[in-house]
């Protein structure tokens, strides 16, 4: 998605099928207020962005309200009247689901069921990662709904859990972004803990491809 025209790099993120963020990096125009023009239908006239992102006082992106739209975004980044980058993209290819909310844990001896509020749209994977201080890496389990049961846990160990949402690649394509991780929650013997001793900080998910 970062194809260059006149040295312009762009990034598109469609946040939770609600807001599209298009950002640009154009070293040639670093001190210029480039303008962003867009339309959701190839036949319409272009609208100009009304909600710019600024970096060091100059335009660097645009935020567009685009709730639940399965549309092509046609856009043009301009220096005055001169287009420096023009493209069209399916917005859903750049979906980033929102971070899981209302994460809940129900324990049954050596198993835990992790639930959270399902997002309002489908074709998603809800991934739970977990580990104890004795594990060298994170274990992972994912389901199509936010109802993931993990079995075979050691009741005496403290486990850290977190959850994220991913768009299914066979539906949305390879260029989507996983959600941010939920807060880390620690559990031992079915009881919530403030922390698990000696648990390293989990790696942050990569935003850009």
């Amino acid at each position: 998605q970062g194809g260059a025209a006149e040295g312009v790099q762009i990034q598109i993120i469609y946040f939770n099928l609600e807001t599209v963020q298009v950002t640009w990096n154009a070293s040639k125009y670093s001190r210029t207020n480039l303008t962003f023009h867009y339309r959701f239908n190839g036949d319409e006239a272009y609208d100009q962005c009304t909600n710019y992102l600024l970096q060091e006082g100059h335009t660097s992106g645009c935020l567009l309200d685009a709730e639940q739209r399965d549309d092509i975004l046609y856009f043009s980044i301009r220096n005055g009247t001169h287009p420096v980058f023009t493209a069209s993209r399916w917005m859903v290819y750049y979906l980033k689901p929102s971070s899981p909310k209302h994460v809940r844990f129900s324990w049954h001896q050596d198993a835990v069921t992790v639930t959270c509020s399902d997002l309002s749209y489908g074709d998603l994977l809800y991934e739970v990662q977990y580990r104890s201080p004795f594990d060298t890496e994170w274990q992972s389990k994912q389901e199509n709904t936010c109802n993931v049961t993990i079995e075979g846990l050691d009741a005496e160990k403290c486990y850290s859990f977190w959850v994220r949402v991913k768009a299914m690649e066979d539906v949305y394509g390879p260029d989507t972004y996983p959600s941010d991780w939920s807060e880390v929650t620690c559990w031992q013997r079915g009881e919530i803990r403030d922390a698990c001793a000696e648990t390293p900080t989990p790696p942050k998910p990569k935003l850009s491809k």
Epitope: N16, E18, S99, K101, R104, S106, W107, D180, T185, I192
Partner: antibody
Framework: QVTLKESGPGILKPSQTLSLTCSFS??????????VGWIRQPSGKGLEWLAH???????YYNPSLKSQLTISKDTSRNQVFLKITSVDTADSATYYC???????????????WGQGTTLTVSS | DIQMTQTTSSLSASLGDRVTISCRAS??????LNWFQQKPDGTVKLLIY???RLHSGVPSKFSGSGSGTDYSLTISNLEQEDIATYFC?????????FGGGTKLEIK
């Protein structure tokens, strides 16, 4: 310290739209995990959760009132808003805003509350 | 929706008493139970979260217990300043719901 304060019109007529503002300080809705909710209490009755907005603009509503409710925020001004359309006398209540506690991750409770603002709906 | 029931709507006790207020959920809420205190002037404070965890600044005279569907709040050595209405709230499933409240009075 954390403080929240609600403001509203005080009196409305049936079918009008209620607009409430929660102004807060001592925390930021830019912080991951943070949220603010609205709860109401008719005089002499129990508490009813209405809506909740999260740091990333996710919104949750009580399904029994969802068609009437809109929650929004202005992060830069430390404010959260609630609109209730087409109010009726049954909407007469004290309306509270409250912060989602962040002391333990994924345990949702409201750790700080405003003092409440009273609404009377009367023709 | 999960119904939260506080069967005792008002409770009368003497200063110095130990008082227990109960709350029942219509289904298992896996310990996601919070307790709030509402003073006569309307001020609301969180006392206990996740069944038994004391919110910061809350005196240790307040304690919570329970599991599954049955939960309780205990206040030891009752004082005048404890006169209030106490509400339970489940945070397990949306919509979050509250009990009807138990009003605590002095004999």
């Amino acid at each position: 310290q954390v403080t929240l304060k609600e403001s509203g019109p005080g009196i409305l007529k049936p079918s009008q739209t209620l607009s409430l503002t929660c102004s807060f300080s001592g925390f930021s809705l830019n912080t991951s995990g943070m949220g603010v909710g609205w709860i109401r209490q008719p005089s002499g009755k129990g508490l009813e959760w209405l809506a909740h907005i999260w740091w990333d603009d996710d919104k949750y509503y009580n399904p029994s009132l969802k068609s009437q409710l809109t929650i929004s925020k202005d992060t830069s001004r430390n404010q959260v808003f609630l609109k209730i359309t087409s109010v009726d006398t049954a909407d007469s209540a004290t309306y509270y805003c409250a912060r989602r506690a962040s002391h333990v991750s994924t345990v949702d409770s409201f750790d700080f509350w405003g003092q409440g603002t009273t609404l009377t709906v009367s023709s | 929706d999960i119904q939260m029931t506080q069967t005792t709507s008002s409770l009368s006790a003497s200063l110095g008493d130990r008082v227990t207020i109960s709350c029942r959920a219509s289904q298992d809420i896996s310990n996601y139970l919070n307790w709030f205190q509402q003073k006569p002037d309307g001020t609301v404070k969180l006392l206990i979260y996740y069944t038994s965890r004391l919110h910061s600044g809350v005196p240790s005279k307040f304690s919570g217990s329970g599991s599954g569907t049955d939960y309780s709040l205990t206040i030891s050595n009752l004082e005048q300043e404890d006169i209030a209405t106490y509400f339970c709230q489940q945070g397990y499933t949306l919509p979050w719901t509250f009990g009807g409240g138990t009003k605590l009075e002095i004999k």
